[in-house]
């Protein structure tokens, strides 16, 4: 009388999260009589996925009338998977009995679940960096499966090359998440500039997942200051003119000061745009001359973004 | 062909012993439990118990515990029920069936029955 | 121990007829219920297994339906042969056991 054999055709199969799975068994012989279980893992801990005998398993469907008297194919569909699922499932052939006795298992077949990443999301710094200085962007996605991924950096679609990548864990897992911190150098002209993350999986099929930030939230671009005076008017005022120019964000305060004290202040907003993302503001001050014995020293006073106040002075010469 | 052949009828007195054997053919025998089933006359069916020859299990109805016995002899393909300490109330057709069920249990292969008479 | 409860006891029928016996099971058993036919003088014959598979060649007019605790056997156009006692079986957990039979006799 030939041996009863448990026989699992696939050692590995690989399905989407969401599609069902099929995990084939058959058995050579209907002898000895006694049920199937479908188990994951092996040992003392092993998960029971489904009995032939009882139980309610409402993901799992065997493929054949487990009540027919003649039936050797155990194969069994589990739908929705998720990668939960992931593991090896052995199909084990049991002989009746009180208990029933544990007499073959098939060699096992290992589900992976192929699982897409979630969209990347980049974070930038908490505060903001002026040019020439270095900012860290970081770049997050989780829960693929399998582990293989790949992740580039691009700023204004030229690919960078300082950045440092992890995946996480570093053993097996039914899903993965992978972290990755790129270095950027600011120039004045990033105001417009983009760092994009784009991941590349299995899952995706040639189609990475890209993730984007906005350098305009990383950046601070100083204010050039200029202080210049116009020709004296026939009433013996002098227009003194500050201009701001090139700076980003627009949050400014301009503060102008005769001899010390503060004369008006104001504040920037709704400025036109330069083509660079960059912002100039134009403030003029009319001195009454003949108002003075002596030369007034005139300051413009402008405080950006919370920076420490950055002051321009000039002179208007008063005639004996 | 497929057949469960059985011994023949006895009568035994209350007290005594019984043996019934039950004679497969035409099958793998090792390959399915056998059950014994008896039927008092103008009674129902009663089920006393269960073997598997392929790893000598056994299951007895509780209330024949101690008093049954069920072996096999794998060389002949013959199963055996031993019924000890007879009463009258004993007096019965015994009957083996092939259990047939993968997952659940169940009876596709019948004996003719022995009858067994207890009376003093 | 499951205890198996069958009715009617008996039933009085024409042929032609369809009959319908049921068996319910003090506690659940999935689809492990069997249906016996005997008659006087011989062994009982298994006419379905699994609550609803019709054992090799049984006739077609025999049925059986139900899971849980709920089942019927449904004979579709009684014949003189059917005249016997019918018995329904668990088959999920030892102890088996059967039901106390529904005598099926000629009106």
């Known amino acids: 009388e030939e041996e009863l054999q448990v026989i699992q055709p696939e050692k590995s199969v690989s399905v989407a999260a969401g599609e069902s799975a099929t995990l084939n068994c058959t058995a050579t012989s209907l002898i000895p009589v006694g049920p199937i279980q479908w188990f994951r893992g092996v040992g003392p801990g092993r998960e029971l996925i489904y009995s032939q005998k009882e139980g309610h398993f409402p993901r799992v469907t065997p493929v054949s009338d487990p009540t027919k008297r003649n039936n050797m194919d155990f194969s069994i569909r589990i739908s929705n998977i998720t990668p939960a699922d992931a593991g090896t499932y052995y199909c084990v052939k049991f002989r009746k009995g009180s208990p029933d006795v544990e007499l073959k298992s098939g060699a096992g077949t290992e589900l992976s679940v192929r699982a897409k990443p979630s969209a990347p999301v980049v974070s930038g710094p908490a505060v903001r960096a002026t040019a020439e200085h270095t900012v860290s962007f970081t770049c997050e996605s989780h829960g693929f499966s399998p582990r293989d991924i790949t992740l580039k950096w691009f700023k204004n679609g030229n690919e960078l090359s300082d950045f440092q990548t992890n995946v996480d864990p570093a053993g097996k897992s039914v899903s993965y998440s992978i972290r990755s911190t790129a270095r950027v150098v600011l120039t004045r002209r990033d105001v417009h500039s983009q760092v994009i993350c784009e991941v590349a999986h299995v899952t995706l099929q040639g189609d990475p997942l890209r993730g984007t930030a906005n350098l305009s939230e990383a950046i601070r671009v100083p204010p050039f200051l200029e202080v210049t005076q116009q020709s004296m008017r026939a009433d013996n005022q002098v227009n003194v003119t500050c201009q701001v120019t090139k700076f980003y964000p627009q949050r400014l305060q301009l503060t102008w000061l005769e001899n010390g004290n503060v004369s008006r202040t104001e504040m920037a907003s709704a400025l036109p745009e330069n083509k660079d993302g960059t912002y100039n503001w134009t403030s003029w001050l009319l001195v009454n001359v003949s108002a003075h014995r002596d030369d007034v020293k005139l300051t413009c006073q402008v405080e950006h973004d919370g920076q420490p106040a950055v002051n321009k002075s000039f002179s208007v010469k008063v005639s004996a | 062909q497929v057949q469960l052949v059985q011994s023949g009828a006895e009568v035994k007195k209350p007290g005594a012993s019984v043996k019934v054997s039950c004679k497969a053919s035409?099958?793998?025998?090792?390959?399915?439990?056998i059950s014994w089933v008896r039927q008092a006359p103008g009674q129902g069916l009663e089920w006393m118990g269960w073997i598997y020859a392929y790893g000598g299990n056994t299951n007895y109805a509780q209330k024949l515990q101690g008093r049954v016995t069920m072996t096999t002899d794998t060389s002949t393909s013959t199963a055996y029920m031993e019924l000890r300490s007879l009463r009258s109330d004993d007096t019965a057709v015994y009957y083996c069936?092939?259990?047939?069920?993968?997952?659940?249990?169940?009876?596709?292969?019948w004996g003719r029955g022995t009858l067994v008479t207890v009376s003093s | 121990d499951i205890q198996m409860t069958q009715s009617p006891s008996s039933v009085s029928a024409s042929v032609g007829d369809r009959v319908t016996i049921t068996c319910r099971a003090s506690?659940?058993?999935?689809?492990?219920l069997a249906w016996y036919q005997q008659k006087p003088g011989k062994a009982p014959k298994l006419l379905i297994y699994a609550a609803s598979n019709l054992q090799s060649g049984v006739p077609s007019r025999f049925s059986g339906s139900g899971s849980g605790t709920d089942f019927t056997l449904t004979i579709s156009s009684l014949q003189p042969e059917d005249f016997a006692t019918y018995y329904c079986?668990?088959?999920?957990?030892?102890?088996?056991?059967f039901g106390g039979g529904t005598k099926v006799e000629i009106k």
């Open positions: 069936a092939r259990e047939a069920g993968s997952s659940w249990y169940d009876f596709d292969l």
């Open positions: 079986q668990q088959g999920a957990s030892f102890p088996i056991t």
């Open positions: 506690q659940g058993i999935s689809s492990w």
């Open positions: 035409g099958y793998t025998f090792t390959g399915y439990p």
